[in-house]
């Protein structure tokens, strides 16, 4: 008697990359001999009730040939993770896993005055943001004269970084001679934003 | 044998209507992804509008967006398209075609549809 | 939309000849890339999907390759029956599906 077998092929890159708000199809095609009697689709340990679709090439008798689909629709950043197809037939189970990164715009969590005379500017985003610093003399909010900041941490490195990444930048506010604001500007591949601080220390936040 | 059979073309005036028809056989239909995808005279392939195998979801072309409506009903095994405000450009053959992953693998024969004045 | 553009978009070939038919992407597809063969009058038929994958039923002639943003469809041996329009199909982006606007094979 035949020993049974399956085998999963993905039909895209199990690496994807998203962005906030869009969709994306996670697809397996798979041989299974016997047929397949149980197909499930986890995230976090949870099972899809819906969202997926699972067909055969054909409905003949020997057929062997699968596919699965799982739909994720308007994915968030806290969506990212790793789903699992799973396969079992009487004989064995089989399983392939998509590591999906959802990419966010930046946003900044926070915006402070430390007692030490620093400015610092957390930011969190997917890639991980970069932090920019700029001096606007006087009232305006144009910036154009960069600052280099004293410390950059990444403050969540540890672990598979499919959340948003948070960023830690500070720069020493004693450099500042002259009344004005300052610009903490943070981006990556899918936006900006920025916040502005004034010498009274009152906090703005525009997205752009 | 899968067979797809559609129906309900011919001409029609711009901004009139039409219900175009696709009845499956050979294969169980509800459980698989359809579309439709048209070819305008000497023209190339554009798809037109898709639908999930329990018909909860649908996607359409820009081209058709808001005119167009997918549908189907599993229990006649069949696929709709509901045409809607028709313009000249829409003058092509429309195809129902089955999804096997993100390929077409099986098409019906087509239906010609003519939007002239 | 993702645009697809195909070349040549027509060629002349012999029997027995290899042809090899190009299919660009404007941006990466990752391998959602289909390639059909339509005759005069008759719907489109599925040769290669997934890129590079052998639709059931068809000769082993044809093959198909590439990833990313180029891809090939190869006829090893062309037949008599082969002389037909060739077209891609990229899925990548869903809705969104295009086709290129096809190749035609003819008799040199």
């Known amino acids: 008697v035949d020993k049974g077998f399956i085998n999963i092929f993905p039909m895209i890159n199990t690496t994807v990359f998203v962005n906030d708000g869009e969709n994306v199809d996670l697809i397996v095609e798979y041989e299974a001999f016997p047929k397949p009697e149980h197909q499930q689709w986890i995230y976090m340990n949870r099972t899809f009730t819906d969202k997926w679709e699972d067909y055969p090439k054909s409905e003949n008798e020997s057929n062997i040939r699968y596919v699965s689909e799982l739909h994720l629709t308007r994915l968030k950043g806290t969506e990212g993770g790793t789903y699992t197809f799973l396969v079992s037939n009487s004989d064995v189970n089989a399983a392939i896993a998509f590591n999906v990164y959802v990419n966010t715009k930046p946003e900044i969590l926070t915006y402070d005055r430390l007692v030490n005379g620093m400015l610092q500017c957390v930011a969190a985003g997917f890639p991980e943001p970069t932090i920019d610093w700029y001096f606007c003399p006087g009232t305006e909010q144009r910036c154009s004269a960069s600052v280099l900041p004293v410390d950059v941490q990444t403050l969540n490195s540890s672990g598979p970084p499919f959340g948003k990444l948070v960023v830690q930048s500070s720069i020493d506010s004693s450099a500042f001679k002259h009344n004005g604001t300052v610009e903490c500007k943070a981006y990556n591949d899918v936006g900006k934003t920025s916040a502005y601080f004034n010498f009274a220390f009152k906090e703005q936040i525009h997205p752009h | 044998e899968v067979q797809l059979l559609e129906s309900g073309g011919g001409l029609v005036q711009p901004g009139g209507s039409l219900r175009l028809s696709c009845a499956a056989s050979g294969f169980t239909f509800s459980r698989y992804p359809m579309n439709w995808v048209r070819q305008a005279p000497g023209k190339g392939l554009e798809w037109v509008s898709g639908i999930r195998s329990s018909g909860g979801a649908t996607s359409y072309a820009d081209s058709v967006k808001g005119r167009f409506t997918i549908s189907r009903d599993n229990s006649k095994n069949t696929l709709y398209l509901q045409m809607n405000s028709l313009r000249a450009e829409d003058t092509a053959v429309y195809y129902c075609t089955r999804s096997f992953g993100r390929a077409f693998d099986y098409w019906g024969q087509g239906t010609l549809v003519t939007v002239s004045s | 939309d993702i645009q697809m553009t195909q070349s040549p978009s027509s060629l002349s070939a012999s029997v027995g000849d290899r042809v090899a038919i190009t299919c660009r992407a404007s941006?990466?597809?990752?391998?959602?890339l289909n390639w059909y063969q339509q005759k005069p009058g008759k719907a489109p038929k599925l040769l290669i999907y997934a890129a590079s994958k052998l639709e059931d039923g068809v000769p082993s002639r044809f093959s198909g390759s590439g990833t990313g943003t180029d891809f090939t469809l190869t006829i090893r041996s062309l037949q008599p029956e082969d002389f037909a329009s060739y077209f891609c199909?990229?899925?990548?982006?869903?809705?969104?599906?295009?086709f290129g606007p096809g190749t035609k094979v003819e008799i040199k």
């Open positions: 941006q990466s597809i990752d391998t959602y």
């Open positions: 199909q990229q899925s990548y982006s869903s809705p969104g599906i295009t």
